[in-house]
Interface confidence: low
């Protein structure tokens, strides 16, 4: 289920799957939510630790049991991923942090009159992930009203420093507030060039596009279909970027499909989940559990309810069925995508709906003159 | 909203505008999306207009002037007014609207979390009221959704300011001693939300007040936590399963 409570002065011991710098616990929680394996997180505010390297540290954690031992740590904040929390799942983060400088690659500097304008510039720049703004009262006059647009390899700051009269924040592209607009077109039999930022296996180009949209550095992608000539590259989704933000070249290529991230779409972003079920397909991965259920939809529901489950295969082989119930294989991987996609099998596969934000599975814990 | 500022897109994605279409169309009240098919608002919004067909509910909007004849809106399937609400009193000023069709959630249109039943222990320090209502007592409906940060006031303090009225435990008050910031006409039914542990919760429903933003006259809101049983009962009995963001 959905657990939203935060634990003050507590730190989860062990289970680390990733770490990064984030300005507060809420942003850390959001990164945990979108990480394929993160179930728990712990965050160390600047006030909680003397070690400069660990200040603003966000530690993403996994656990086979879904829980980890909590240790007392003054100032630390821990909590759960919001996977399975329905509408609360959002990559949108509007907060502006005063007195904080989020470090990264500064690729653009301009003078603006307010931090809101700086955030808007970041939101309207295809490569900008976060920004810092030096206010009117910044100690060095020449830097006052400077708006620094930034990016980093992981989409989070490479460091966060406490610095007076500096304000920082993130791009509002995940809030569907970009003025850039997006290319919805999918280009059949076309391969894009440029830098690969990640490689995953997907059953179709639409899943590839959604993964690209929510990857911090993916601007466009190329997908190799299941009939691509090189067997080892079938169903490969290559997430790509470039200096300019657009592909520098494209090559006509049979059985490839290319397209763009939808992060810059105005007003609507795709859900960060994949609801389609793929008949005759087997998704390979680490076995989490095997259960007998009646029908592929129940298998998907079972996967969705089991928080660590990322995808599933429902077998229809006679030896895997008892009366009207058949085996539902609940699986996971390091990156949330199948490690193998096989066709022509007696069964169907699909993904957990734990990151779908439309579900009703979300929970929020915790007369004179009428107007 | 008196003393407020413009909101930005998606800042308050649960805020809806309740409008009436007769010969002309106008905004009458606010409301809060609490589920795919449910809006929570004030009962007094329906005092003179119980005709569900004349109401249009706009969600996912910021600027009322952007509404055209082509702007999609929701229609009402059912209006559920609290059984103890009386037109002549300010008590139990709460109503649920069941929409004819469920809404999809987006960054600009999604529900607000409800508080836990009888939530009295949480100390809310970051509370906001939003709406398109008047920006002064004898004002007019605003085009852009307004927001204002207002502190909660204890019921004891509130009762002192409203000697002629009974401020019950099922009400919550908010305002500045010096006035200047408040909800006003047209904000009725809209949300008083507070951020706690990074999460927004619907603490109150804009209900009434003496004028708007007057000194030592806080706004009075229906306390949502006190009506959680009622909300759950009505939303669950309607179709057998909770359709809003209920407390764990």
């Amino acid at each position: 289920g959905c657990l939203t409570q935060l634990y003050e002065n507590a730190f989860f011991r062990g289970g680390d799957v990733a770490s990064m710098y984030t300005p507060n616990a809420q942003y850390c929680q959001m990164r945990c939510t979108f990480h394929p394996r993160c179930l728990l997180f712990s965050f160390l505010p600047a006030s909680s630790i003397n070690d400069m390297e660990k200040r603003f540290g966000c530690f993403l954690k996994d656990s086979v049991t879904g829980t980890l031992p909590k240790v007392h740590r003054t100032g630390a904040v821990s909590g759960h991923s919001l996977k399975q929390c329905g509408h609360q799942i959002s990559a949108c983060h509007r907060d502006i942090y005063k007195g904080v400088d989020m470090r990264g690659v500064n690729f653009n500097v301009s003078k603006v009159s307010s931090v809101e304008e700086c955030q808007k510039r970041c939101t309207s720049n295809i490569r900008c992930q976060f920004f810092s703004y030096a206010t009117q009262t910044f100690h060095k006059a020449e830097y006052r009203n400077n708006c620094l647009l930034k990016y980093s390899p992981g989409g989070t700051p490479t460091a966060i420093k406490v610095l007076s009269n500096v304000e920082s924040g993130f791009s509002l592209k995940p809030c569907a507030l970009s003025e850039i607009g997006c290319h919805m077109n999918i280009f059949q039999h076309l391969a894009f060039s440029d830098v690969d930022v990640a490689r995953v296996l997907t059953p179709d180009a639409f899943v590839c596009r959604t993964i690209c949209t929510y990857h911090p550095n993916c601007l466009f992608f190329t997908f190799y279909t299941n009939v691509w000539k090189i067997e080892s590259q079938r169903n490969v989704c290559l997430l790509k970027t470039s200096e300019s933000g657009t592909p520098s070249s494209s090559t006509p290529q049979e059985n490839t499909i290319s397209g763009y991230s939808l992060l810059t779409c105005k007003r609507t972003l795709p859900e960060p989940c994949h609801s389609k079920i793929y008949p005759g397909v087997d998704f390979g991965g680490e076995e989490l559990n095997v259960t007998f259920v009646k029908g592929v939809n129940v298998c998907q529901e079972t996967c969705t309810k089991m928080i660590r489950c990322q995808f599933f295969t429902y077998s229809l082989l006679p030896e895997d069925c008892k009366e009207e119930k058949c085996k539902c294989f609940l699986r996971l991987s390091m990156d949330g995508s199948p490690t193998r996609i096989a066709y022509g099998t007696q069964g169907s596969s699909g993904y957990s709906l734990r990151l779908c934000n439309t579900g009703d599975n979300s929970v929020c814990t915790t007369k004179t003159s009428t107007r | 909203i008196v003393g407020g500022t413009n909101s930005s897109w998606g800042e308050w994605p649960w805020q809806v505008s309740l409008q009436v279409k007769l010969t002309a169309q106008r905004h009458l009240c606010g409301g809060s999306l609490i589920g795919h098919q449910w809006v929570l608002t004030a009962a007094h919004c329906f005092d003179g207009l119980p005709l569900q067909d004349v109401w249009r509910i706009y969600s996912g909007i910021l600027n009322l002037s952007d509404i055209t004849k082509d702007t999609p809106f929701s229609q009402i399937k059912e209006i559920i007014i609290h059984q103890n609400y009386k037109v002549s009193e300010g008590n139990h000023d709460i109503a649920l609207i069941k929409l004819q069709a469920p809404l999809n959630y987006t960054e600009f249109q999604k529900p607000i979390c409800l508080p836990s039943k009888g939530d009295t222990s949480t100390i809310y320090t970051n509370c906001w009221v939003t709406g398109w209502g008047f920006s002064k007592e004898k004002g007019e409906i605003q085009n852009i959704l307004q927001k204002v940060n207002i502190p909660l006031v204890t019921n004891e303090e509130c009762q002192k300011r409203y000697q002629d009225y009974k401020i019950t435990q099922r009400m919550v008050c908010a305002g500045y001693k010096e006035g200047g910031k408040d909800a006003c006409k047209g904000d009725s039914g809209g949300p008083l939300v507070c951020k706690h542990n990074g999460m927004w919760r619907l603490v109150g429903i804009t209900s009434w007040g003496e004028g708007c933003a007057r000194r030592e006259q806080p706004g009075v809101y229906t306390k949502v936590a006190e009506y959680m049983d009622w909300i759950l009962e009505k939303t669950q009995s309607s179709d057998g399963k909770a359709q809003m963001q209920s407390p764990a």
């Epitope: - | 106008r26 329906f46 005092d47 207009l49 119980p50 005709l51 059912e78």
Partner: antibody
Framework: EVQLLESGGGLVQPGGSLRLSCAAS????????MMWVRQAPGKGLEWVSG????????VYADSVKGRFTISRDNSKNTLYLQMNSLRAEDTAVYYC???????????????WGQGTMVTVSS | DIQMTQSPSTLSASVGDRVTITCRAS??????LAWYQQKPGKAPNLLIY???TLESGVPSRFSGSGSGTEFTLTISSLQPDDFATYYC????????FGQGTKVEIK
């Protein structure tokens, strides 16, 4: 005691005008939606017009739209119906009515006046 | 506009009879239907609202049922005071009355 008292009826020629009043007492007039309903001699009931508690919103039956105007003066606890361009088919007893309950969604009318007769004839 | 059709127009009955009047709406009105009784020279009197809820002070021999488009008013045992004209009224969208049913002595 709750009471509605209509007045202003009478004989008028086709094309003429008449203003009906309904004096309310025994309840907080300003809190309620108010209605005019009419009944032609020997015929059934027909809803004519309604007005929002504050007076800000008015609704009319198609048969009177553009000719009749409903209004209210909450300070005087009075409801009005200004009838212009009267026709023979407007001849009827005119009742004012409202719903007393605290749940306005159930807006059948439980409180009615005794009616005032309007005759349109040359 | 929603039309309301009542039947029968006239009904002859005796004291003690069970009387049923029906009302049909031209489109679904959920349960937003009321029944009124009217005597000559008098204002109508509300009997039932929301299709089946008895108005306070109304004798229990009156009952209402139905939802959507079909509605019924039943008088379980007709009393001398019940000879009158009965109207149904929808209030789903504005207000429309049926043409009335006159209950007269057989």
């Amino acid at each position: 005691e709750v009471q509605l008292l209509e007045s202003g009826g009478g004989l008028v020629q086709p094309g003429g005008s008449l203003r009906l009043s309904c004096a309310a007492s025994g309840f907080t007039f300003s809190h309620y939606i108010m209605m005019w309903v009419r009944q032609a001699p020997g015929k059934g009931l027909e809803w004519v017009s309604g007005i929002y508690s504050s007076g800000g919103i008015t609704v009319y039956a198609d048969s009177v739209k553009g000719r009749f105007t409903i209004s209210r003066d909450n300070s005087k606890n009075t409801l009005y119906l200004q009838m212009n361009s009267l026709r023979a088919e407007d001849t009827a007893v005119y009742y004012c009515a409202y719903r007393r309950t605290g749940v306005p969604r159930w807006d059948a009318f439980d409180i009615w006046g005794q009616g005032t007769m309007v005759t349109v004839s040359s | 506009d929603i039309q309301m059709t009542q039947s029968p127009s006239t009904l002859s009955a005796s004291v003690g009879d069970r009387v049923t009047i029906t009302c049909r709406a031209s489109q679904s009105i959920s349960s937003w239907l009321a029944w009124y009784q009217q005597k000559p020279g008098k204002a109508p009197n509300l009997l039932i609202y929301k299709a089946s809820t008895l108005e306070s002070g109304v004798p229990s021999r009156f009952s209402g049922s139905g939802s959507g488009t079909e509605f019924t008013l039943t008088i379980s045992s007709l009393q001398p005071d019940d000879f009158a004209t009965y109207y149904c009224q929808q209030y789903n969208t504005y207000w429309t009355f049926g043409q009335g049913t006159k209950v007269e002595i057989k």
